[in-house]
């Protein structure tokens, strides 16, 4: 629990290098995110493919969308889960994280040293060990988030099941409805490729307790649902007097010292540019 | 035929507590969340919270919350609603309901006939 | 939360007048719902989506608007009509119903 009160920030006195002073854990062992790069990477042959179960949620079934102050958050159901690890991991919730309009790069994870213009989390917890997420999260093997790297390109309708909401979320404490439909479209290709390491909440309290599935692949959204995320919504009240912008939502990538991340794939990415046949 | 059937109203002191019941019939049960309505005498109708029979999750009118407790009996296909520390203003009848999506958007397309609970002593 | 206010709160009309009850919304809302009750009944699914009607609701019914500001329509009243009419709102948490607009016979 934080020494006082719950007040952080990404920007100004209560910002990351602030976070410890409150939160112990931040300045603490296995902390995320971090830079994936080629000198820490080794390949694992027993990273065999997740399976992603109840993630084709019903329309007709209501989930909650809430601006938390930090970040605009999707509450998903307990019946949603990933098969394959260690244990059964319910699914919690799931956010996002981002730069803005004028400096579009806000992933958390980096792929060597650069940052992707947005990241999605997709937050689960141990349920065969732990009752619900908020036990769980201080737990060893308590939580399991996949990340997913989002990048500028087509237009992502999947997303857009999400971001067409945002204008209802606008401030801190707002809440919507959002029509159940399936979170795998949320996911790259070729999810059988991703990263795997253990680390940390990447918020305050940072809890080192994440199992890290960071996918190999990035997915797209276009230029203006970028825009619209970046520019959507506050971290503040409505009624607030000074209105802060949610921008620039991520953490700094941090230490990761005689540690590995482990790949499902090896290293080589395959060419298939067009001409080679 | 589908049906939601509420039970369980009648009297309750102040300070009490009520269990009401939603039975359901007509169709896929986990389908479809089960949400309870309640409406005070001459007045309108006011949202307490709902389930998803599929998991028993479970969302709140915040005004609400603490107070109102919704659970499931899958087996039974009976949604209930708990509410503690009664109050006069809590005289109502109170109504569950099913939501469709239908075409982008939703509707309680069906309701049950209302049980009224009354708080006096 | 999004306050909605229906008016008029009572109407008094004749069989074949042109009846409009509006509902206007504290924030802007995607879509507008109707529902209909009489006496001793359960509320009805009357108009979704805005401007859909319901299965078996009669044409004379309709719905309109967009924002804050919505409407339903009744182009000529019947004596089946008379009933009390709620909006609602589905956009936010809580989810919020209007107070209601009754239509009684003149």
């Known amino acids: 629990a934080p020494v006082n009160g719950s007040k952080w920030t990404y920007f100004g006195p209560d910002g990351e290098n602030s976070w410890s002073k409150k939160y112990p854990s931040c300045g603490g062992l296995l902390q995320s995110p971090i830079d994936l790069h080629s000198d820490i990477l080794q390949y694992d042959a027993s990273l065999t493919p997740l399976e992603f179960q109840g993630y084709n949620l019903s329309a007709n079934k209501q989930f909650l969308l809430t601006n938390n102050g930090h970040s605009v958050k999707l509450n998903l159901p307990s019946d949603m889960h990933i098969q394959g690890l260690q244990s059964r991991y319910s699914a919690t919730q799931l956010h996002l994280h981002w730069g803005n309009p004028n400096d579009p790069h806000g992933s958390e994870h980096t792929v060597s040293g650069q940052h992707f213009a947005a990241e999605l989390h997709i937050v689960h917890y141990n349920s065969d060990l732990y009752p619900d997420a908020s036990t769980a999260s201080n737990k060893s093997e308590g939580l399991a988030v996949l990340a997913v790297l989002i990048e500028m390109g087509s237009f992502n309708p999947s997303y857009d099941k999400i971001f067409s909401h945002l204008q209802h979320v606008k401030y801190k404490g707002q809440e919507a409805f959002v029509p159940g439909f399936n979170i795998e479209e949320l996911l790259p290709e070729r999810t059988a490729e991703y990263y795997r390491y253990r680390g940390s909440l990447t918020t305050p309290p940072c809890n080192p307790t994440v199992l890290w599935t960071v996918f190999r692949n990035p997915v797209q959204i276009s230029q203006e649902q970028l825009l619209a995320l970046e520019t959507a919504l506050y971290c503040t009240h409505m009624d607030d007097p000074s209105p802060r912008e949610m921008i620039n939502n991520f953490r700094q990538v941090q230490k990761f010292d005689e540690r590995l991340v482990y790949t499902s794939f090896s290293q080589v990415q395959v060419c298939t540019a067009a001409g080679l046949s | 035929e589908v049906q939601l059937v509420e039970s369980g109203g009648g009297l309750v002191q102040p300070g009490g507590s009520l269990r009401l019941s939603c039975a359901a019939s007509g169709y896929s049960y986990t389908d479809y969340n089960i949400y309870w309505v309640r409406q005070a005498p001459g007045k309108g109708l006011e949202w307490v919270g709902y389930?998803?029979?599929?998991?028993?999750?479970?969302t709140y009118n915040q005004k609400f919350k603490g107070r109102a407790t919704i659970s499931v009996d899958k087996s039974k296909n009976t949604a209930y609603l708990q509410m503690n520390s009664l109050r006069a203003e809590d005289t109502a009848v109170y109504y569950c309901?099913?939501?469709?999506?239908?075409?982008?958007?939703?509707?309680?397309?069906?309701w049950g006939q209302g049980t009224l609970v009354t708080v006096s002593s | 939360d999004i306050q909605m206010t229906q008016s008029p709160s009572s109407l008094s009309a004749s069989v074949g007048d042109r009846v409009t009850i509006t509902c206007r919304a504290s924030?802007?809302?995607?879509?507008m719902h109707w529902y209909q009750q009489k006496p001793g009944k359960a509320p009805k699914p009357w108009i979704y989506g805005t401007s859909r009607l319901v299965s078996g609701v009669p044409s004379r019914f309709s719905g309109s608007g967009s924002g804050t500001d919505f409407t339903l329509t009744i182009s000529s009243l019947q004596p089946e009509d008379f009933a009390t009419y709620y909006c609602q709102q589905w956009s936010s948490n809580p989810l919020t119903f209007g107070q209601g607009t009754k239509v009684e016979i003149k």
């Open positions: 924030s802007s809302v995607t879509y």
């Open positions: 309901s099913r939501p469709i999506y239908y075409g982008a958007y939703w509707y309680f397309d069906v």
């Open positions: 389930i998803d029979p599929a998991n028993g999750d479970t």
